[in-house]
């Protein structure tokens, strides 16, 4: 039990996308504000989002410190104007959030193609590596750099005028497709992480069709 | 435990219609690729189509394009096979299969089978 | 469609054996092979995946290479349980294929 008007926070749920990580709760303040708190399993505590009434607080700077370490945090509760108040035991209340870990849980963001090229029956479709917040040696890590062939990229691949998905995949940025001569093509693709159990699949990205301005077109 | 459970199969006239089921336990469909799978009696396999249950996505054999539909149910976690204008040459059993959607796109984990028989 | 051409379409052995099957795709693809048991009615169950790799609780006496659009199967000493039929599959590109399947049957 805390002080009179605090009440714990609840809720707890871990938001991560492409290691973008926000730790969301509940309820709404009244009278009281927040303070998170987040450690590795070994490690000591931290303290984020300082007496904040928001009900959010975005720890990526904590988690991209190493994305394969397992994360736990807690959001305390205070009273309004009367921060340094605890509860009957001396301690303020706080409720704990599940286990996170990053690198198998952040959810995969939309891919982009980033470009397609025909050269005769060959298409060459690029997806865009999307730049994350993890850093080595200060710079930004690609999505790549960071899950290597852990992730891979499925194509779906249609003639304009058919409606069956052919598929194709890899563990690079690119693929290399055999593609009907005269016949313009559409692509969608879906970015995957074959070992994992949940949060396998990104969504699908914008469909890009051939005779669009991202594709080249060149006849040998 | 991962488990694909066919139903459905049967004795059906040829140009009539059936509804094969695979229910899967064990795992999220959506978060896989479901394939049918046929086996004539005492022929090899032959694969029949593929659904992405998270966004309907699919593609058949040519020998069944146009007759065959598969859909899935993701809040039942079940794929379908609807076949029509079935003909002798699609007696077989039929099997579903997961795609673990790796690189090399293994199959790795079947159902038993369900036994469709085309005969007048 | 690629081809997946596979021989012998049946063999004898004995267990203790060492059985090599092969299977020659049509085109390129890649490392995208697998290897299925199968044994009469029942599902076809995964031995082998990208080519050479031992799929779970797999016996090691089972091995797959590749060499180009060549892959092979192994079986270094066979065991009672392994009589069965073995089929390749290609999936590089749509539609997967198989290869039309290896009988072994005990000498």
């Known amino acids: 039990s805390g002080t009179t008007n605090t009440v714990a926070a609840y809720n707890l749920t871990w938001k991560s996308t492409n290691f973008k990580t926000i730790l969301e709760w509940e309820p709404k303040p009244v009278n009281q504000v927040y303070t998170v708190q987040i450690s590795t399993k070994s490690g000591d505590w931290k303290s984020k989002c300082f007496y904040t009434t928001d009900t959010e607080c975005d720890l990526t700077d904590e988690i991209v410190k190493d994305v394969k370490q397992t994360y736990l945090a807690r959001v305390f509760s205070y009273p309004a104007g009367n921060v340094e108040s605890t509860g009957s035991a001396g301690e303020p209340l706080y409720e704990n959030s599940p286990e996170f870990t990053p690198y198998l849980e952040t959810n995969l963001g939309q891919p982009t193609i980033q470009s397609f090229e025909q050269v005769g029956t060959k298409v060459n479709v690029t997806v865009e590596d999307e730049r994350t917040l993890v850093r080595r040696n200060n710079t930004f890590l690609s999505l790549r750099d960071v899950f290597g062939k852990d992730l891979i990229y499925t194509l779906y691949y249609w003639k304009s005028s058919s409606s069956g998905k052919k598929t194709a995949k890899t563990n690079t940025n690119e693929f290399l497709i055999d593609v009907d001569k005269g016949e313009n093509y559409c692509f969608s693709v879906q970015a995957v992480i074959p070992s994992r159990t949940v949060n396998r699949k990104s969504t699908d990205s914008p469909v890009e069709c051939m005779g669009q301005e991202k594709g080249e077109f060149r006849e040998i | 435990e991962v488990q694909l459970v066919e139903s459905g199969g049967g004795l059906v006239q040829p140009g009539g219609s059936l509804r094969l089921s695979c229910a899967a336990s064990?795992?999220?469909?959506?978060?896989?690729?479901i394939h049918w799978v046929r086996q004539a009696p005492g022929k090899g396999l032959e694969w029949v189509g593929y659904?992405?249950?998270?966004?309907?996505?699919?593609y058949y054999a040519d020998s069944v394009k146009g007759r065959f539909t598969i859909s899935a149910d993701t809040s039942k976690n079940t794929a379908y096979l609807q076949m029509n204008s079935l003909r002798a040459e699609d007696t077989a059993v039929y099997y579903c299969?997961?795609?673990?959607?790796?690189?090399?796109?293994?199959?790795?984990?079947w159902g038993q089978g369900t036994l469709v028989t085309v005969s007048s | 469609d690629i081809q997946m051409t596979q021989s012998p379409s049946s063999l004898s052995a004995s267990v203790g054996d060492r059985v090599t099957i092969t299977c020659r795709a049509s085109q390129d693809v890649n490392t995208a092979v697998a290897w299925y048991q199968q044994k009469p009615g029942k599902a076809p169950k995964l031995l082998i995946y990208?080519?050479?790799f031992l799929y779970s609780g797999v016996p090691s006496r089972f091995s797959g290479s590749r060499s180009g659009t060549d892959f092979t199967l192994t079986i270094s000493s066979l065991q009672p349980e392994d009589f069965a039929t073995y089929y390749c599959q290609q999936h590089y590109t749509t539609p997967p294929t198989f290869g039309q399947g290896t009988k072994v049957e005990i000498k």
């Open positions: 064990g795992f999220t469909i959506s978060y896989y690729i």
């Open positions: 299969a997961r795609d673990v959607q790796s690189v090399s796109g293994e199959f790795d984990y």
């Open positions: 990208s080519a050479s």
């Open positions: 659904i992405d249950p998270s966004n309907g996505y699919t």
